[in-house]
């Protein structure tokens, strides 16, 4: 993982200062308030993950 300023995170990932590493934007579906989600190009269109069908 690269620190901010040294190299960007790879496509589909965003830097989390909270976790000190690049994180997958896909996880923003379940945890939309994560700090790195602000850096993801676009929020996934699906709503927050259902707990039960």
């Amino acid at each position: 993982e690269q620190a901010p300023g040294t190299a960007p995170c790879s496509r589909g990932r965003s830097w989390s200062a909270d976790l000190d590493k690049c994180m997958d934007c896909a996880s923003c579906r379940a945890r939309p308030h994560s700090d790195f989600c602000l850096g993801c190009a676009a929020a996934p269109p699906a709503p927050f993950r259902l707990l039960w069908p």
Partner: antibody, heavy 119, light 111 residues
Amino acid sequence: EVKLGESGGGLVQPGGSMKLSCVASGFPFTKYWMNWVRQSPEKGLEWVAEIRLKSDNYATHYAESAKGRFTISRDDSRSSVYLQMNNLRAEDTAIYYCSPTYADTMDYWGQGTSVTVSS
Amino acid sequence: DIVLTQSPASLAVSLGQRATISCKASQSVSTSTYSYMQWYQQRPGQSPKLLIKYASKLDSGVPARFSGSGSGTDFTLNIHPVEEEDTATYYCQHSWELPYTFGGGTRLEIK
């Protein structure tokens, strides 16, 4: 280096109780949801329970097979997660693993602790 | 609950050849952007280990011999070229909703 150490397994009679523990290190425990997953030859890998964060009021979720009998809890000060299992049945016999997840992936697994329910 | 059906249940592949494992979900586990499917490897006598997340993203440290593909309900794990150390059981797992469920596993033997 991430380490997960499960303990508390053993032999218990049907109807009995058991409390499993898992001590974690090497990752920011307070920021990860924690899961218990079990594995048996009969049912394969089976998710059992999940506990979320303090900011989520430690929300818990259970598989149908665990509801009403199992209770998951965590102690962030000890980087530990627990599984209290009551009214145990033969079909609860399995290896029990704890695993952290940030959102979707069970990133790390411990070595597991074996639970045998038999008379 | 979402049911994950893996096939084949077991397969034997010659060293250096390709192993292909399928996982079919009883309903879609994909958005237009991401697929919520993971693959795990469990070597004999060991705990499961995350290999692939979100259908196609290799976890850190996983060799490029492993690849994942698919979306919707149909997913595939490919290993090429297979090596001796790939002898293991492979499981798919979805994170679309609770409860999380796993496939029944595919046992890979290297000939």
